[in-house]
């Protein structure tokens, strides 16, 4: 079939039909890209959006049950999603163990060991207690 495109008027000739390029007047939303159709247009949506005009939010929580790790709760949002992490975890997908040692108050000279949502202090000789703040009576 004869196919001709006249750039000045955005006209396509397919056989004996005249098909106008509908993309100049498109209304693709949320980053959608217009793709001309026969007497209409379609929208190619970014991953976070769907629907004929990219107006429907994709529910990533439904599509990716493991979007949030380590017990985090997935919260769908317009154009994306977020994770509500349980204590001890952080990051976009709750995959990062919070460094509890950064806020720990182990006595100087002791060694902090990071755990999930907690920390422990490894005491040097002669010290005891959770924070190694006590003198170890056994070593006196």
């Amino acid at each position: 079939a004869h196919h001709h495109h006249h750039h000045g008027e955005n006209l396509y000739f397919q056989g004996s039909e005249r098909n106008i390029d509908d993309c100049p007047n498109h209304r693709c939303q949320n980053g959608g890209v217009c793709v001309d159709g026969v007497n209409t247009y379609n929208c190619r949506c970014p991953p976070q959006w769907t629907g004929q005009f990219c107006t429907e939010d994709v529910d990533e929580c439904l599509l990716q049950p493991n979007a949030c790790q380590n017990g985090g709760t997935c919260a769908n949002r317009n154009g994306g999603y977020g994770c509500v992490c349980v204590n001890g975890w952080s990051g976009d997908d709750c995959s990062e163990n919070i460094d509890d040692c950064a806020f720990a108050s182990c006595t100087p000279g002791s060694t902090c060991i990071d755990r999930v949502a907690s920390f422990s202090c490894m005491c040097p000789e002669g010290k005891a207690g959770l924070l190694c703040h006590l003198d170890d009576a056994g070593n006196s």
Epitope: D22, P24, N25, H26, R27, C28, Q29, N30, G31, G32, V33, Y41, P46, Q52, F53, T55, N78
Partner: antibody, heavy 120, light 107 residues
């Protein structure tokens, strides 16, 4: 909170020019289509011009009644939309509204409007 | 351009009444229809988008329906604050076009 505030309206003679501004806040300006809509006194709403978002290269569309006379533009650094109106006619007299196209094929936020009067 | 035929142009009703406004488009707009409320001296306010979806903060007495070329806005039980002018608008393609408006007046 999404806010749109128009300014720049006033009285102008036929053939004259005027530049309207619309300062926006509360959202990422470049992510949204922005529109100008007008309303003559006691009449209905008439769409004037649109500028698409960054994802659509900020492309522009005009109504037939203002094409070649009006120019829509935006300054992302100032979060401001503009409407430059040249060769004004008496029939351009109206309240001009700036609105946000909220990604739903609908205008979900509007400014308070600014009155443009074209009269000799 | 897509033509919008809105009816009636005005309606007199009482508080508690059910009010129905219709909008017909000259071609299929694939449910790309919005409804707005406008009060004198104020900006339009979005009520319904996507033909049937209620905008955040809009009372549930407002509802929209329709597809193709025929659309309806219904106010199930008219309240004193609902007396205003209502407009339909197609968002399928530019130029955006609005219906002529329906003024809801107190009977």
């Amino acid at each position: 909170e999404v806010q749109l505030v128009e300014s720049g309206g006033g009285l102008v003679q036929p053939g004259g020019s005027l530049k309207l501004s619309c300062a926006v806040s509360g959202f990422t300006f470049s992510d949204f289509y922005m529109e100008w809509v007008r309303q003559a006194s006691g009449k209905g709403l008439e769409w004037v011009a649109a500028q698409r978002n960054k994802a659509n290269d900020f492309s522009i569309v005009y109504s037939a009644s203002v094409k070649d006379r009006f120019t829509i533009s935006r300054d992302d650094s100032k979060s401001t939309l503009y409407l430059q109106m040249n060769s004004l006619k008496t029939e351009d007299t109206a309240v001009y509204y700036c609105s946000r196209d909220g990604g739903k094929l609908a205008l979900d936020a509007w400014g308070q409007g600014t009155l443009v009067t074209v009269s000799s | 351009d897509i033509q919008m035929t809105q009816s009636p142009s005005s309606v007199s009703a009482s508080v508690g009444d059910r009010v129905t406004i219709t909008c017909q488009t000259s071609e299929d707009i694939y449910s790309g229809l919005a409804w707005y409320q406008q009060k004198p001296g104020k900006s339009p306010k979005l009520l319904i988008y996507g033909a049937s979806r209620l905008q955040d903060g809009v009372p549930s007495r407002f509802s929209g329906s329709g597809s193709g070329t025929d659309y309806t806005l219904t106010i199930s039980s008219l309240q004193p604050e609902d007396f205003a002018t209502y407009y339909c608008q197609q968002g399928f393609k530019y130029p955006l076009t609005f219906g002529g408006g329906t003024k809801v007046e107190i009977k």
